[in-house]
Amino acid sequence: HTAAQDNCTCPTNKMTVCSPDGPGGRCQCRALGSGMAVDCSTLTSKCLLLKARMSAPKNARTLVRPSEHALVDNDGLYDPDCDPEGRFKARQCNQTSVCWCVNSVGVRRTDKGDLSLRCDELVRTHHILIDLRHRPTAGAFNHSDLDAELRRLFRERYRLHPKFVAAVHYEQPTIQIELRQNTSQKAAGDVDIGDAAYYFERDIKGESLFQGRGGLDLRVRGEPLQVERTLIYYLDEIPPKFSMKRLTA
């Protein structure tokens, strides 16, 4: 697994413990919480990142204050169960034996139940809508410049293949980034749109997961793009199963 050999760190995931104890003294990095070896040449899965977040030092919460533009974090943090590949297990349960089914980005997609609840398969989130509102600027950004900059960001920073950025919509001050990736489209080695969206979300909040990189400095033709609100919507290949009671509440 690719890690920075000189001082043995993981460029793509600071929530790791790295040591030169791999084969031949090579640097090997393991995710906090799960202890799973991670590939530092690409993004770490969201499941492993959430698990690491739950066991990170308190300093990771007290010393990293979300940026002033960050949204309030209501992303339903929990300590997930990950499979041997680092993906979310379809069924998640808490310490009090309350269980629920999740999609491939770890978001609950059924009502909560008990240990008898069955989640037959991990349903793939194939469409992610990232809604951003930027801070007021002198004028609107040029749409094609904004589109190019955001596509460049997802390609270079998150290593997401350009074909998975379906569209960038802009109606000042709202930006909507559409990520699409069907099961059939995702080849071995492709970054998952759910992982890219999670890294982006953490970057926007000023809580970068990258080792030794400052936070996001988004600029469109030299003009800073400062995000003041973010909403992320997830659409699954199979619609979620919530009771009518929840839907009418």
Partner: antibody, heavy 118, light 106 residues
Framework: QVQLVQSGAEVKKPGASVKVSCKAS????????MNWVKQAPGQGLEWIGI????????TYNQKFQGKVTITVDKSTSTVYMELSSLRSEDTAVYYC???????????WGQGTTVTVSS | DIQMTQSPSSLSASVGDRVTITCQAS??????LAWYQKKPGKAPKLLIH???NLQTGVPSRFSGSGSGTDFTFTISSLQPEDIATYYC????????FGQGTKLEIK
């Protein structure tokens, strides 16, 4: 190679202030936190405070609150520590230290001796 | 605030000896403990982080173990160049160093 280079030794009178600098090179400056650590003569190491150069946020050891101010100049990749109202007990070697991703201190400056004497 | 109690404060050993230093935290710090070597007139040097992970370039005679509140640092076979003062550092909740252990050759 990561290098932290600190400013030279200082001799100050009681009541004065001193500003020590720490210039970083060899890695992304805003990607790591920076700390200051004190070692008084014959004593152990004491953590003073931390700054996140990206946002400029600081957190201090309660013991040094009001005594120390940590600032950053991103344009020169330099962190500063100012000690005010100096007293003889402030005589010490002060080190800057980079915080790794999980915050332990992986690289250190060479140290700056501050002597407070009338 | 987390307190770190390091012992012994000093110890004398012969070249080739196995040397053990302990650090006790006043509350659970998981495995967020590092060990440093400090020589007079020099900056501290990171030896071990996350309780037992050897920093790149550090000889394998140095090791660490523990979890929660009790931690141990070991030099399996003392070498003359190991003469120094050793400090533990908890980095779970802010930062606290142990008082240090001064290691001397008999």
């Amino acid at each position: 190679q990561v290098q932290l280079v600190q400013s030279g030794a200082e001799v100050k009178k009681p009541g004065a202030s001193v500003k020590v600098s720490c210039k970083a090179s060899g890695s992304s400056f805003t990607g790591y936190t920076m700390n200051w650590v004190k070692q008084a003569p014959g004593q152990g190491l004491e953590w003073i405070g931390i700054i996140n150069p990206y946002q400029g946020d600081t957190t201090y050891n309660q013991k040094f609150q009001g005594k120390v101010t940590i600032t950053v100049d991103k344009s020169t990749s330099t962190v500063y520590m100012e000690l005010s109202s100096l007293r003889s007990e402030d005589t010490a070697v002060y080190y800057c230290a980079r915080g790794a991703g999980l915050y332990y201190f992986d690289y250190w400056g060479q140290g700056t001796t501050v002597t407070v004497s009338s | 605030d987390i307190q770190m109690t390091q012992s012994p404060s000093s110890l004398s050993a012969s070249v080739g000896d196995r040397v053990t230093i302990t650090c006790q935290a006043s509350q659970d710090i998981n495995k967020y403990l590092a060990w440093y070597q400090k020589k007079p007139g020099k900056a501290p040097k990171l030896l071990i982080h996350y309780t037992s992970n050897l920093q790149t370039g550090v000889p394998s005679r140095f090791s660490g173990s523990g979890s929660g509140t009790d931690f141990t640092f070991t030099i399996s076979s003392l070498q003359p160049e190991d003469i120094a003062t050793y400090y533990c550092l908890q980095y779970d909740d802010l930062f606290t160093f142990g008082q240090g252990t001064k290691l001397e050759i008999k």
